[in-house]
């Protein structure tokens, strides 16, 4: 399948208005302080640059790689060095190590401003008076906010976006009908960004083959009618697409997207009776709805799997045979029938198959040796179960807020060398656990909870990765990609955390608080629930509770007074010495 | 279940002072915010006082500020009210209450166990 033009190829693909959204999304991500202008430059130049290309694909340079020509555009920025410091370096390289060298710099967490939401009368403003530039200030915003958001998906996203402004700024009340569709498209913009980190995160610290199998697992619960050979296609497919994606070859990424979209749907009745519907829709809709489509019905009458993997007497021929192969049809079986079952739960089971096998195939009677593979299971499946009803027991009590603190003050004891905003995102984010998957029946709670947890704790383990001040924190995330969360649940308090010196200023409280939402307060509360665990790390759940308690009814008491900021000043004073009398800080 | 039970009111003059008590059994007293309320003939209950879990900390109502002192002997399980400098408006049966899980600090609902409550009548 070569082209003699790659950068022209794409751009016949993918048609012009996709091809230069995608080269912004690319470079966006990659420079991820250079502002608005500067990209929508670039991206001009790259695009009359493919239609030259387009026109006649033997005209000077159209035969470089997309690489090639890409980088060569960034590293023309002249600014490289004063905003980005040691990225510059790359300019100095060849392909691919140029490309390798930009990848590794992308950050998780850029220094940039938070969003803040304009009026809806000046956002439909800018939207009527130039719907081109508002569309693309949304593709580089997000872009380079989540510099591994799966672009194909963010094309889709901003299709929602721009029908949402289409449909509300002709509305009677266009913030009743704006509003609630731009929360819903950033929860789950949020969402998809942080699925799709996990994805990179996975082929690039742990490989393909670690890839793969959550594919095998993931598509076989999916599309349990399916062949394994059809499943295997899929998954290698599906591989090519997220490993372009992650590596920063979004055309190419957003092409297979399309191609594998079309296979799926061409094949429908071999893949799964749930696509009907989806495969009725325009590309990008396709191509999301496929992504998230529910799994289909299981076959009526499978086997048992014992009969194959455990009593057959031929398993250690098979094992031998293709390692992986085997391994993948019993990853396959395994999922097929355990829809109730998360991802990462199912991987851990193949990998006891697996270590059962490596251990068994060289002893004196395999077959004695590995007959009571199936018992090992049982833990491992009870395990998450267990903590998913605990947990679940605590959210209904307790609430989504008092659930977050809950997990706030767990994650600060385990480990109080992260930083605190780092502990309150993850932490709020654990906790929405309870209200996403706890009201699910028991057949659809640990999949939604612990594939979800999976997502979480990447957030935490991608965040730390930046700036690492915990060995414990390093070892859950590098072990074991599927063992990340039992890894967590494990730890226990840290003892040999010296308390963090007392400093009157981080719980210096202003009336500003008082005008904030009611989650920024949230937030404001828990990050000060927080720095008290890492103060007092002995402190009970009780006290910290009571302290809590003290802390809003001083806001309380200050945001209803006349002149809130003296009150803020003088009773924040006194309640920092109470909490300091009582907790002895 | 949390037991709550006031003492010390009674009929006093204008200026005059007393000390109410609230003695608590059952539920952890210690790790709880108590609060004071009082409610005259035809009115809502109002706020009068917080105490802190570890009685450090306290506010009160503007209409008593300056007047009223809270505390607590988390030994005893007992909160205390003393008021000093009486006025007729401060006829009211008060109560005690024990906080809650959630909801304001100021309004009766934040509070989970209450008392019976204790008459004190101001003459003037």
């Known amino acids: 399948d070569a082209h003699k033009s790659e950068v022209a190829h794409r751009f016949k693909d993918l048609g012009e208005e996709n091809f230069k959204a995608l080269v912004l999304i690319a470079f966006a991500q990659y420079l991820q302080q250079c502002p608005f202008e500067d990209h929508v430059k670039l991206v001009n130049e790259v695009t009359e640059f493919a239609k030259t290309c387009v026109a006649d694909e033997s005209a000077e340079n159209c035969d470089k790689s997309l690489h090639t020509l890409f980088g060569d555009k960034l590293c023309t920025v002249a600014t490289l060095r004063e905003t980005y410091g040691e990225m510059a370096d790359c300019c100095a390289k060849q392909e691919p190590e140029r490309n390798e060298c930009f990848l590794q710099h992308k950050d998780d967490n850029p220094n940039l401003p938070r969003l803040v939401r304009p009026e809806v009368d000046v956002m439909c403003t800018a939207f009527h008076d130039n719907e081109e530039t508002f569309l693309k200030k949304y593709l580089y915003e997000i872009a380079r906010r989540h510099p591994y958001f799966y672009a194909p998906e963010l094309l889709f996203f901003a299709k929602r976006y721009k029908a949402a402004f289409t449909e509300c700024c002709q509305a009677a009340d266009k913030a009743a009908c704006l509003l609630p569709k731009l929360d819903e498209l950033r929860d789950e913009g949020k969402a998809s960004s942080a699925k799709q980190r996990l994805k990179c995160a996975s082929l690039q610290k742990f490989g393909e083959r670690a890839f793969k199998a959550w594919a095998v697992a993931r598509l076989s619960q999916r599309f349990p009618k399916a062949e394994f050979a059809e499943v295997s296609k899929l998954v290698t497919d599906l591989t090519k697409v997220h490993t372009e994606c992650c590596h920063g070859d979004l055309l190419e990424c957003a092409d297979d997207r399309a191609d594998l979209a079309k296979y799926i749907c061409e094949n429908q009745d071999s893949i799964s009776s749930k696509l009907k519907e989806c495969c009725e829709k325009p590309l990008l809709e396709k191509s999301h709805c496929i992504a998230e489509v529910e799994n289909d019905e299981m076959p009526a009458d499978l086997p048992s799997l014992a009969a194959d993997f455990v009593e057959s007497k031929d398993v250690c021929k098979n094992y031998a045979e293709a390692k992986d192969v085997f391994l993948g049809m019993f990853l396959y079986e395994y999922a097929r029938r355990h829809p109730d079952y998360s991802v990462v739960l199912l991987l851990r089971l193949a990998k006891t198959y697996e270590t059962t096998l490596e251990k068994c195939c060289a002893a004196a009677d395999p077959h004695e040796c590995y007959a009571k593979v199936f018992d090992e299971f049982k833990p491992l499946v009870e395990e998450p179960q267990n903590l998913i009803k605990q947990n679940c027991e605590l959210f209904e009590q307790l609430g989504e807020y008092k659930f977050q603190n809950a997990l706030l003050v767990r994650y600060t004891k385990k480990v109080p060398q992260v930083s605190t905003p780092t502990l309150v995102e993850v932490s709020r984010n654990l906790g929405k656990v309870g209200s996403k998957c706890c009201k699910h029946p028991e057949a659809k709670r640990m999949p939604c909870a612990e594939d979800y947890l999976s997502v979480v704790l990447n957030q935490l383990c991608v965040l730390h990765e930046k700036t690492p001040v915990s060995d414990r924190v390093t070892k859950c995330c590098t072990e074991s990609l599927v063992n990340r969360r039992p890894c967590f649940s494990a730890l226990e308090v840290d003892e040999t955390y010296v308390p963090k010196e007392f400093n009157a200023e981080t719980f210096t409280f202003h009336a500003d608080i008082c005008t904030l939402s009611e989650k920024e307060r949230q937030i404001k509360k828990q990050t000060a629930l927080v720095e008290l665990v890492k103060h007092k790390p002995k402190a009970t759940k009780e006290q910290l509770k009571a302290v809590m308690d003290d802390f809003a009814a001083f806001v309380e008491k200050c945001c209803k007074a006349d002149d809130k900021e003296t009150c803020f000043a003088e009773e924040g004073k006194k309640l920092v010495a109470a909490s300091q009398a009582a907790l002895g800080l | 279940q949390v037991q709550l039970v006031e003492s010390g009111g009674g009929l006093v003059q204008a200026g005059d002072s007393l000390r109410l008590s609230c003695a608590a059994s059952?539920?952890?007293?210690?790790?709880?915010?108590m609060g004071w309320f009082r409610q005259a003939p035809g009115k809502e209950r109002e706020f009068v006082a917080r105490?802190?879990?570890?009685?450090?900390?306290?506010y009160y109502a503007d209409s008593v500020k300056g007047r009223f002192t809270g505390s607590r002997d988390n030994a005893k399980n007992t909160v205390y009210l003393q008021m000093n400098s009486l006025k007729p408006e401060d006829t009211a049966v008060y109560y005690c209450?024990?906080?809650?899980?959630?909801?304001?600090?100021?309004?009766?609902?934040?509070?989970?166990?209450w008392g019976q409550g204790t008459q004190v009548t101001v003459s003037s």
């Open positions: 209450a024990q906080r809650g899980d959630s909801g304001s600090n100021y309004d009766p609902s934040g509070y989970s166990y």
């Open positions: 059952g539920r952890t007293f210690s790790g709880y915010a």
């Open positions: 105490i802190n879990w570890s009685g450090t900390l306290t």
